[in-house]
């Protein structure tokens, strides 16, 4: 049974304030069951950066669309870039449940962002 | 083509068991959730159980006496339904899940089912 | 448990003639309703996904609308072929997945 896997391919994204973060993460299996949600830095000071089923996240939208079919792509991409968007931003597996569980984490990306140039 | 044959059942008295299976074909069974939907005589569709890797979700109304279960080696999906009643009589479905977007599941391809009749 | 109410029950119907299908769910499900139909003898055959996505090979008179809690199925002109029962499904909140009861079209 091969496993699922949380794919982060980059390691780190640099983007000049203003201008618009694509963080990429696919995943290898449509199972288990269950949620996919975005998170800036880890444990349990975490913040959420993204999670379609509830909340509101103005700055952030998926990349792929929405009506696709058993989509296996969950990139983000994040507008208006500011300095205060810097950190390592994961993506997360979660199983359904009553509370959905976490399952598997992405390798994390290093957003930094670069002054604006004049 | 997508292609889920059921098979299994049949006539059984109250309290006894009976095992339906499902075979898939024509898509990467492994990487989908699959389910089970069940329609009593003249009724409407209720579902019943679905399945994602060791995941497993059932309705109320079959918990503790139905279980889920698959064999990706054989692309083959299972209902071990135990202590059954009269209520359960119905035809079965098998179904493929399919998700769209960031959201839960819908059924996008269907067997032809399978008749359980429970009556003593 | 999320309940869908389908209405009406029964709708009696010559063919050619426009009909609409509703779908009323107890709480908000925001646009994650699918609609089936289901011949006599027949499985259940997904017709539309995520309130308005045609699924592959379905004519484009049929037309799914839509969000929260009010949903509506509408077939343009209704073919022969077109007569069943067809029924809602939510998949926002669940377990359970639940359906609405179906609406029968009949030939009138």
């Known amino acids: 049974e091969e496993e699922l896997q949380v794919i982060q391919p980059e390691k780190s994204v640099s983007v000049a304030a203003g201008d618009s973060a694509t963080l990429n993460c696919t995943v290898s299996s449509l199972i288990p069951v269950g949620p996919i949600q975005w998170f800036r830095g880890a444990g349990p000071g975490r913040e959420l950066i993204y999670n379609l089923k509830e909340g509101h996240f103005p700055r952030v939208t998926a990349v792929s669309d929405p009506t696709k079919r058993n989509n296996m792509d969950f990139s983000i991409r994040i507008s208006n870039i500011t300095p205060a968007d810097a950190g390592t931003y994961y993506c997360v597996k979660f199983r359904k449940g009553s509370p959905d569980v976490e399952l598997k984490s992405g390798a994390g990306t290093e957003l930094s962002v670069r002054a604006k140039p004049s | 083509d997508v292609q889920l044959v059921e098979s299994g059942g049949g006539v059984v008295r109250p309290g006894e068991s009976l095992r339906l299976s499902c075979a898939a074909s024509g898509f990467s069974f492994s990487i989908y959730a699959m389910s089970w939907v069940r329609q009593a005589p003249g009724e409407g569709l209720e579902w019943v159980s679905t399945i994602g890797a060791d995941d497993t979700y059932y309705a109320d109304s079959v918990k503790g006496r139905f279980t889920i279960s698959r064999d990706n080696s054989k692309n083959t999906l299972y209902l071990q339904m135990n202590s059954l009643r009269a209520e359960d009589t119905a035809v079965y479905y098998c179904?493929?899940?399919?998700?769209?977007?960031?959201?839960?599941?819908?059924?996008?391809?269907w067997g032809l089912g399978t008749l359980v009749t429970v009556s003593s | 448990e999320i309940v869908l109410t389908q209405s009406p029950a029964t709708l009696s119907v010559s063919p050619g003639e426009r009909v609409t299908f509703s779908c009323r769910a107890s709480?908000?499900?925001?646009?994650?309703i699918a609609w089936y139909q289901q011949k006599p003898g027949q499985a259940p055959r997904l017709l539309i996904y995520?309130?308005?996505s045609r699924d592959t090979g379905i004519p484009d008179r049929f037309s799914g609308s839509g969000s929260g809690t009010d949903f509506t199925l509408t077939i343009s002109s209704l073919q022969s072929e077109d007569f069943g029962v067809y029924y809602c499904q939510q998949y926002y909140d669940w377990p359970p997945f639940t359906f609405g009861g179906g609406t029968k079209v009949e030939i009138k």
């Open positions: 995520a309130a308005s």
């Open positions: 179904a493929k899940d399919s998700t769209v977007g960031w959201s839960g599941d819908f059924f996008d391809y």
């Open positions: 709480q908000n499900v925001r646009s994650d």
